[in-house]
């Protein structure tokens, strides 16, 4: 696993300071609280009409 | 490197019970769920029981098998999970392993520990 | 609960040919972008090992020897060339609910 600065993340992961290494957006399903859940693109954002109405 | 040794099996009689213990390194055990597989040539491999963080109330879940007689619990001070496991029956034979999961992979293994359920 | 069904229970391949090996669930464990499979390897007298995650992300240090593919509720597990030490059993388990549940498992052997 690469360090943060370095080579990104592999396709379909995103890097996890909590945890030091790169980590899979599958397991965002089950855990969408983890830091690393915030670089993956599993969910597209919302519409920005939906963000401000 | 990642170590998980359990302890605690041997023989018990049906109706026993009987306490495994799972001690970790090599990984954050704090941030990681923590659960409980056995192995049977009868069954093969069968999920125990799992438990979850701190920040989860330590969160517990278990297999119907498992509902009313096992009990998973966690010390995080001594990076180990434990599983109390009474009013065993003979189908409970098996060889208990002990495994990390941040969510859906159980990413290693101990060596076991085995059961045996006899009179 | 999801019942996965492996097959075949058993099967004998020849050094550096092809292994397949097949796993079916009861119900769909995919979402349109991750499937929650996985599949283990359990040496003779060893304790089992993660290979493969989310049905075709190889674990760290696993040869590229080794590759998942699938989706929904059929998934596959490839092995090419197979080497010696494949001789082992191969088991899939899912992680979409629940409780999690694992396949009956294939013996590889290698002839």
């Known amino acids: 696993e690469q360090a943060p600065g370095t080579a990104p993340c592999s396709r379909g992961s995103s890097w996890s300071a909590d945890l030091d290494k790169c980590m899979d957006c599958a397991s965002c399903r089950a855990r969408p609280k983890s830091d690393f859940c915030l670089g993956c693109a599993a969910a597209p954002p919302a519409p920005f009409r939906l963000l401000w109405p | 490197e990642v170590k998980l040794g359990e302890s605690g099996g041997g023989l018990v009689q049906p109706g026993g019970s009987m306490k495994l213990s799972c001690v970790a390194s090599?990984?954050?055990?704090?941030?990681?769920?923590m659960n409980w597989v056995r192995q049977s040539p009868e069954k093969g491999l069968e999920w125990v029981a799992e438990i979850r963080l701190k920040s989860d109330n330590y969160a517990t879940h278990y297999a119907e098998s498992a509902k009313g007689r096992f009990t998973i619990s966690r010390d995080d001070s001594r990076s180990s999970v434990y599983l109390q496991m009474n009013n065993l029956r003979a189908e409970d034979t098996a060889i208990y392993y002990c495994?990390?999961?941040?969510?859906?992979?159980?990413?290693?293994w101990g060596q076991g520990t085995s059961v045996t359920v006899s009179s | 609960d999801i019942v996965l069904t492996q097959s075949p229970a058993s099967l004998a391949v020849s050094l550096g040919q092809r292994a397949t090996i097949s796993c079916k669930a009861s119900?769909?464990?995919?979402?349109?972008?991750?499937?929650?499979m996985q599949w283990y390897q359990q040496r003779p007298g060893q304790s089992p090992k993660l290979l493969i995650k989310y049905a075709s992300k190889l674990d760290s240090g696993v040869p590229a020897r080794f590759s998942g593919s699938g989706s929904g509720t059929d998934f596959t597990l490839n092995i090419h060339p197979v080497e010696e030490e494949d001789t082992a059993t191969y088991y899939c388990q899912h992680s979409w609910e629940l409780p999690y549940t694992f396949g009956g498992g294939t013996r590889l052997e290698i002839k």
């Open positions: 119900q769909s464990v995919s979402t349109s972008t991750y499937s929650y």
């Open positions: 495994s990390p999961t941040y969510a859906d992979t159980m990413d290693y």
């Open positions: 090599g990984f954050p055990f704090t941030k990681y769920w």
